[in-house]
Every structure is written in structure tokens, then in C-alpha cells.
């Protein structure tokens, strides 16, 4: 019987810099029941909170609701293992919300054929941010990333859209059902898990682009 | 705790390249974004570019962009800091840093001496 | 590229007394979020830097509380309350608040 192993908080997420959650990754448990705390203070303060949420995002979390969240702060935490012989603390962790949004999933894919008569024929992809993120603010710029490949084929093709939320596509092989997907990232976070897929099917008489 | 091992001191000729590895151990290494930073003989300090190593996001400063190239290796807890094209300016040191959910560096390398002479 | 300006260039101070650094950058390093990132970074001979000070005024843990920042737009100050012969090294300035993020020169401390 030992006192516990040194735990490790190894991600901290925000939707949208309005709540965030930090998980850890617990040591070794010593052989005996152990128990787990989150403390933290902000920058320029000296008094020690306790984490005021350790339900709302699992096992070993600590969610920060909105009262609890500030974007002007960082937050200086560790977390504490304490069994019958001893306890051990996590390194000191360093978090600035601005630097751990994940977004939700861009919404509203849509991909339609569009075949002009004057000019080669082009899959438009259009979507919409997610609803979380206010981007009136100007906190947040939004990058966006499209995949898309022949339903049967492995790889994805991969193209960048930058800030815009549409995106046109010239390079296609016809008669193919395509599979359409997208994700956003902030510009100083993390990209969003991809959006659900939308299916395409290329008309056989679409024309390749030179 | 939380370390940064940089490979060893390199001496190249000019217009070749050099890669410089940073193994990282005392954390999961996927967690946290990791930067490049390098220092001429005498000279400041100069941000050459970062990556995240989840998912390989990168971003570079624009002054070395199309000659270094940033990648990482989840498997080894390694990055690596790929330069081309080398002049003799490029004589530096080169260190590997990590910050945490922050924009700061917490975590140095012990950096790496390349060495650029014909 | 926002430019950061460090005076003096070198600085030779007695012990225990103090010492003041300054540090101006081309813009503003107020970021959208209202945060500004502006830090301190000490390297001491031979070492790799340090982290000193971050967000203006803010120590960083373990670092003595002889260490203070202060500032703010684009007109920022280190100051070394009482210098202590641990404290030689060059002190840089850096921005984060725009890319790419840059350094000052920096200011070479020594004791007298």
C-alpha cells in the first residue's frame, strides 16, 4: 500500500469561451480508495477555489460553468490525490479560454451540382457556423476544412476554405456518390469533430476539369 | 515532470537541410501545441512556427514559410523542425517550447547548435 | 511583424539595488480577447530562457516577487526591485497577442 501516483490534467475544452471542462488522467491508486480534487486560483490572486463542478463532464472532470468562467484570467490549477498514505499533485497547469475552444460541428451542410451553361460544371458546398459561437464579437475568427471523396474510395480529399462559408469544387469524377463533410476551428483552438456527412451524386454527364 | 530532449549540434552546407527532433516525456504529448524558436550567435530570440500535435495543425512565421517544416510523431512523442535551403544566417540555436492552455512559453528544450559553413 | 524595442541594451547593476527594463512595441498588444500578451523572459549563461512574467504583470510560479511588470498599449516595464547576483542573464521581452509572435533584443544584466 502506497500513497497515490501523480495525476495529470491532460485536456481542458471550451464551446465557446463561455464554459470550459478539464480532464485528468489519475496515477496509480497505491492499492487504496483514493480521492481526486481540482483546486485553482486565477492570475493575480492569491485565494484557492475548489472546482465547482466535477458531475457535469464525467469521470476525473472539472466543468466551469458560466459564473465560473472568465476569458480576461487565466487559470493556475492542479489536481490533488490523496489516499489513507499520503497524496501527490499534478504539475501546475496554465489556462487561457481563449486557448482551448473546440467548437461544435459547422451546421446546415448543404452541396448541390451547379451546371452554368457557359462555364465548367462545379459542386457548390455551402454551411453555416455553429450556433455556440458568436462571431458578431470579432473574439472569434473561424477557419473552415471540407473533405470529400468518392463513397467506395479510402482517401478523403482535403481542401481549406479559410473564413468563408461557401466553397466550389471543379474536380470531380462523374457518375460518382460523393461524401461531403466539414469542420471549423477558431484560430487559436482546436477543429471541431467533422459535420455529418451530406451525399452527393456527380451526374455521368459532369465534365472533369482540365 | 515535464521534459524537452533535442537531438545533438549538426553541421551542414549551405542549400542543404536539417532536422531537428524534440522528444518530449512528463506528459501526454498530444495535449499541448508545441513551438520552434531559434537564436543566431549573440542574437535575440525568433518564433519560427508551431504545431498542434493532435491533428497536425500548423502555423509558420511567414519569413521562413516554404523553407521549414514542422511535424510530429505521436508514436515517439517526438517533433521535429525540418529546414531547407540553408544559408549561413541560419546558424542558430534552435529550441523546441512548450506552453501550456496559454500563449507563453512554459517549457524549453535544451536547444539544438546548427551550424551552417561551406 | 510587430517590432519590439528593449532599452537599455545592457545594464550593470550593484546588488541589492534595483533595476528597471523597458520594453515598446510598433502596435498595440491589446488582443481581441481584452487580454495583452505581452512577457518576460529571463536566460541565464549557457541555459535555455525562462519564463519571468506573463500577461504584463503576472508572476509565473517559483519566480521571487522582487520581479514585477507593469505597463500596458505599447509601453511595458521589468523591474528588479533588489538585484541579487542569481539574476545575471539577458531579459527579452516578447509579444504573443499577434503573428508572428516576436521578441525584443533583449537587456544583459550584470552585477557590478
Known amino acids: 500500500q502506497l500513497p497515490p501516483g501523480k495525476p495529470e490534467i491532460f485536456k481542458c475544452r471550451s464551446p465557446n469561451k463561455e464554459t470550459f471542462t478539464c480532464w485528468w488522467r489519475p496515477g496509480t491508486d497505491g492499492g487504496l480508495p483514493t480521492n481526486y480534487s481540482l483546486t485553482y486560483h486565477r492570475e493575480g490572486e492569491t485565494l484557492m477555489h475548489e472546482c465547482p463542478d466535477y458531475i457535469t463532464g464525467g469521470p476525473n472532470s472539472c466543468h466551469f460553468g458560466k459564473q465560473y468562467t472568465s476569458m480576461w484570467r487565466t487559470y493556475i490549477m492542479m489536481v490533488n490525490a490523496t489516499n489513507q498514505m499520503g497524496s501527490s499533485f499534478s504539475d501546475e497547469l496554465y489556462v487561457d479560454v481563449t486557448y482551448i475552444v473546440q467548437p461544435d460541428p459547422p451546421l446546415e451542410l448543404a452541396v448541390e451540382v451547379k451546371q452554368p451553361e457557359d462555364r465548367k460544371p462545379y459542386l457548390w458546398i455551402k454551411w453555416s457556423p455553429p450556433t455556440l459561437i458568436d462571431l458578431k464579437t470579432g473574439w472569434f475568427t473561424l477557419l473552415y476544412e471540407i473533405r470529400l471523396k468518392p463513397e467506395k474510395a479510402a482517401e478523403w480529399e482535403i481542401h481549406f476554405a479559410g473564413q468563408q462559408t461557401e466553397f466550389k469544387i471543379l474536380s470531380l469524377h462523374p457518375g460518382q456518390k460523393y461524401l461531403v463533410q466539414v469542420r471549423c476551428k477558431p484560430d487559436h483552438g482546436y477543429w471541431s469533430a467533422w459535420s455529418p456527412a451530406t451525399f452527393i451524386q456527380i451526374p455521368s454527364d459532369f465534365t472533369m476539369n482540365d | 515532470q515535464v521534459q524537452l530532449v533535442q537531438s545533438g549540434a549538426e553541421v551542414k552546407k549551405p542549400g542543404s537541410s536539417v532536422k531537428v527532433s524534440c522528444k518530449a516525456s512528463?506528459?501526454?504529448?498530444?495535449?499541448?501545441?508545441m513551438h520552434w524558436v531559434r537564436q543566431a550567435p549573440g542574437q535575440g530570440l525568433e518564433w519560427m512556427g508551431v504545431?498542434?500535435?493532435?491533428?497536425?495543425?500548423?502555423n509558420y512565421n511567414q519569413k521562413f514559410k516554404g523553407r521549414v517544416t514542422i511535424t510530429a510523431d505521436e508514436s515517439t512523442s517526438t517533433a521535429y523542425m525540418e529546414l531547407s535551403s540553408l544559408r549561413s544566417e541560419d546558424t542558430a540555436v534552435y529550441y523546441c517550447?512548450?506552453?501550456?492552455?496559454?500563449?507563453?512559453?512554459?517549457?524549453w528544450g535544451q536547444g539544438t547548435l546548427v551550424t551552417v559553413s561551406s | 511583424d510587430i517590432v519590439m524595442t528593449q532599452t537599455p541594451l545592457s545594464l550593470s547593476v550593484t546588488p541589492g539595488q534595483p533595476a528597471s527594463i523597458s520594453c515598446r512595441s510598433s502596435q498595440r498588444l491589446v488582443h481581441s480577447n481584452g487580454n495583452t500578451y505581452l512577457h518576460w523572459y529571463l536566460q541565464k549563461p549557457g541555459q535555455s530562457p525562462q519564463l519571468l512574467i506573463y500577461k504584463v504583470s503576472n508572476r509565473f510560479s517559483g519566480v521571487p516577487d522582487r520581479f514585477s511588470g507593469s505597463g500596458s498599449g505599447t509601453d511595458f516595464t521589468l523591474k528588479i526591485s533588489r538585484v541579487e547576483a542569481e539574476d545575471v542573464g539577458v531579459y527579452y521581452c516578447?509579444?504573443?497577442?499577434?503573428?508572428?509572435?516576436?521578441f525584443g533584443g533583449g537587456t544583459k544584466v550584470e552585477i557590478k
Open positions: 516578447s509579444q504573443s497577442t499577434h503573428v508572428p509572435w516576436t
Open positions: 512528463g506528459y501526454t504529448f498530444t495535449s499541448f501545441w
Open positions: 517550447a512548450r506552453g501550456d492552455y496559454s500563449n507563453w512559453f512554459t517549457y
Open positions: 504545431i498542434d500535435p493532435s491533428d497536425t495543425y500548423t
